[in-house]
Amino acid sequence: LEVQVPEDPVVALVGTDATLCCSFSPEPGFSLAQLNLIWQLTDTKQLVHSFAEGQDQGSAYANRTALFPDLLAQGNASLRLQRVRVADEGSFTCFVSIRDFGSAAVSLQVAAPYSKPSMTLEPNKDLRPGDTVTITCSSYRGYPEAEVFWQDGQGVPLTGNVTTSQMANEQGLFDVHSVLRVVLGANGTYSCLVRNPVLQQDAHGSVTITGQPMTFP
C-alpha cells in the first residue's frame, strides 16, 4: 500500500495549528471498517493518534491532535496538531493498513519569529573617537537558533570581536544576545541583523554614534 506524505518539512509557527498531510489510495468498495490508521512519533514510536475498527480512537498526544473524519474515506489520513510547541518538532509516521499496509514519515519544523532587536551601549556617555565600546544586540523568543550578522554604516560585515550567546527558555524559545566590541571612529552606525533560518525572517537593530548625542533608531 502506497502512503504519501510531503517530501519537505511542514513548517509551523509556535502556537498555531499544523496539518501533517498523509494520503492513500482506497480501492473500490473500501469502507472505514477496514481501515487501521496509526500516527506515531517516528523515533520513539510513541502513539499520537489512531483510527481502528471504524472509529476514531482519539489522541494519545496531550489531546492536541485530530483527524479529518469526513475525508478518511477518500484516502485523506492527515493529522491536525493544535497549538504547536517547540517540543513537537520532529518526524511523525503515518501508518495505514487496509488489506495491505504501508507507512511514510513527515517532518514537522517548528519556528517562531525573533523580536526586533534592542541595542545597548557600554559605556553610553562621554564617548570619543578611539574609545572602545561594547554594543549589545538582544532579540527574544525565536526558534530555531538565530544567525546573527553585524555591519557598519557602509554595509561592511563586522566579524571580529563578536560574541553571540543563545539561551532557550522553558518553552524552548531562544533569546539571543550578541556583543560587538568596536573602536569608535569619528561617527558611525552599527547594525545587527538577527535572522531566523527557517522563516528567512530578518530582524534589524542599529545604533548611530555621532559624538554627542547618540541616537537609537
Epitope: 502512503v3 487501521n36 496509526i38 506515531q40 517516528t42 523515533d43 520513539t44 514510536k45 518526524s91 509516521t93 503515518c94 501508518f95 493498513s97 499496509f101 504501508g102 507507512s103 511514510a104 514519515a105
Partner: antibody, heavy 119, light 110 residues
C-alpha cells in the same frame, strides 16, 4: 519487491567481534522502515537483537545492549550489526528483517546466515 | 526463557482446526500489537498475522489471529500437511524491545 541479504564471516573466535551486513535491494534503506536483526541459536527460538531507523535512532534488546551496535549506511543502502565479546552462546543463524514503521511486525526477512563462535 | 510463553507443541489431523496460545503481561501483549510467524524447516520466518488479527496479502484466510487482555491466539483451520512448521508470536514491550514467544511446533498427524 524489496529483498534483504545478510553477509559476513561464518566463523568468529571467542572474545572477538561479530560483524554482519544486510544489503537492501528493491527499495531504500531511507524509507519509512525500521531495520532489525534477529537471531536463532540451533534448535532454539527467535531472539530480537535490535533495530535502526535511517535517522540513526536505535533500540536494542536490554540483555544484549552493552555488546551491540547497529549502524546504517545510506550510500551503500545497507545496515550492519556489530556484536562484541562473543562467546559460543552467540552461535546462531542471524537474520535481518524489515518492520514497516507503525506495523509492529517484521514483514520481510533475509534468508539468514549461520555464524559459529569457536576457537 | 521468554517472557512471552507458548506451548512447545500442538498437533491435529489434516482438515482439523488448531489454536496456538501466546501469553504475556500488561508490559508487552497487554499494551502492544501481536504478530504471528510461520517458520518452515530450514527457512526464514514468514509473517502470517500483524496488528493482532490482520493478514498480509497472500496469507490464506485459514489463518486468523485474536487478542484478549494479555493473551493472543493464532487459529489455523483446514489443516494441511504443508502447515507443519514452528509458529512464533511476537510483540513489543515497554522498553521498545521486540519480544518473541518460545515457539510452538505444529505437527499435522498423518
Amino acid at each position: 519487491q524489496l529483498q534483504l541479504q545478510e553477509s559476513g564471516p561464518g566463523l568468529v573466535k571467542p572474545s572477538e567481534t561479530l560483524s554482519l551486513t544486510c544489503a537492501v535491494s528493491g527499495g531504500s534503506v531511507s524509507s519509512s522502515n525500521w531495520w532489525s536483526w534477529v537471531r536463532q541459536p540451533p534448535g532454539k527460538g527467535l531472539e530480537w537483537i535490535g533495530e535502526i531507523y535511517h535517522s540513526g535512532s536505535t533500540n536494542y534488546n536490554p540483555s544484549l545492549k552493552s555488546r551491540v551496535t547497529i549502524s546504517v549506511d545510506k550510500s551503500k543502502n545497507q545496515f550492519s550489526l556489530h556484536l562484541n565479546s562473543v562467546t559460543p552462546e552467540d552461535t546462531a543463524v542471524y537474520y535481518c528483517a524489515r518492520e514497516v514503521a507503525g506495523s509492529a511486525a517484521f514483514d520481510i526477512w533475509g534468508q539468514g546466515t549461520m555464524v559459529t563462535v569457536s576457537s | 526463557q521468554s517472557v512471552v510463553t507458548q506451548p512447545p507443541s500442538v498437533s491435529a489431523a489434516p482438515g482439523q482446526k488448531v489454536t496456538i496460545s501466546c501469553s504475556g503481561s500488561s508490559s508487552n501483549i497487554g499494551n502492544n500489537y501481536v504478530s504471528w510467524y510461520q517458520q518452515l524447516p530450514g527457512t526464514a520466518p514468514k509473517l502470517l498475522i500483524y496488528g493482532n488479527n490482520k493478514r498480509p496479502s497472500g496469507i490464506p484466510d485459514r489463518f486468523s489471529g485474536s487478542k484478549s487482555g494479555t493473551s493472543a491466539t493464532l487459529g489455523i483451520t483446514g489443516l494441511q500437511t504443508g502447515d507443519e512448521a514452528d509458529y512464533y508470536c511476537g510483540t513489543w514491550d515497554s522498553s521498545l524491545s521486540a519480544v518473541f514467544g518460545g515457539g510452538t511446533q505444529l505437527t499435522v498427524l498423518a
